[in-house]
């Protein structure tokens, strides 16, 4: 015998209290597949979470994060604080990148500047907290007699010594 509940489409549930007829999901609930015996409660996007897509009778609400935060986890289960470029998020909040490291995004960690000399290249543009160094041509690529493009070592910025 076919289960009468299998005829209930998405957006409804099979109501055992009413002879297994298909009843619409109540407000603030949904069923995304047919044959459901209950509807699921809609996700509420509250606080730091904002509604990206409203809940419908057949699909759950989708959330993202209010400005200043970004999503983490499946389905944006968490909102993590943004930092400024040139910073990284630590247990004590946003902290400036240490000298010799950079972060060009509002999330993630500070990464070491590229070591141009490992590729036999010279530094064309110094690194900053927000930007990696730009490597120039290797000294061998320079025409004879051309002056070096390697600028002097950058002075340490006050307040940005290694922590």
């Amino acid at each position: 015998l076919q289960d009468p509940c299998s005829n209930c489409p998405a957006g409804t549930f099979c109501d055992n209290n009413r002879n297994q007829i298909c009843s619409p999901c109540p407000p603030n609930s949904f069923s995304s597949a047919g044959g459901q015996r209950t509807c699921d409660i809609c996700r509420q996007c509250k606080g730091v979470f904002r509604t990206r897509k409203e809940c419908s009778s057949t699909s759950n609400a989708e959330c993202d994060c209010t400005p200043g935060f970004h999503c983490l986890g499946a389905g944006c289960s968490m909102c993590e604080q943004d930092c400024k470029q040139g910073q990284e998020l630590t247990k004590k909040g946003c902290k400036d990148c240490c000298f010799g490291t950079f972060n060009d995004q509002k999330r993630g960690i500070c990464r070491p500047w590229t070591n141009c000399s490992l590729d036999g290249k010279s530094v064309l543009v110094n690194g900053t907290k927000e930007r990696d160094v730009v490597c120039g041509p290797s000294p061998a690529d320079l025409s004879p007699g051309a002056s070096s493009v390697t600028p002097p070592a950058p002075a340490r910025e006050p307040g940005h010594s290694p922590q």
Epitope: G47, M78, E80
Partner: nanobody, 121 residues
Framework: QVQLQESGGGLVQAGGSLRLSCAAS????????IGWFRQAPGKEREGVLC????????YYADSVKGRFTISRDNAKNTVYLQMTNLKPEDTAVYLC??????????????WGQGTQVTVSS
Amino acid sequence: QVQLQESGGGLVQAGGSLRLSCAASGFTFDDYAIGWFRQAPGKEREGVLCISSSGGSTYYADSVKGRFTISRDNAKNTVYLQMTNLKPEDTAVYLCGAPRDCSRYSSDDYWGQGTQVTVSS
């Protein structure tokens, strides 16, 4: 039952002060941070300030630095947002949330309903 209840909002003139309270019940208050957010009419909700379980402050909004401070009284399960030199652009509904950590909020975190702050010029 978990509850966060904001109070202390009201109407104040520009340059004035208000102290908002966020009173918590139904969970181990000492283990949680408390973050304040605000939503002005027609604008995105924005983070304001947060206090960690150990008492450290995190400013989410640069615009409130030097004007707003945050403190907590674990004996009273309450966090206070002291707002001074208020400006008309501070007008908003202020609500508090209780994450484990000021830098990361979960969809399971607790939130209050909010209290209205109106700053007239």
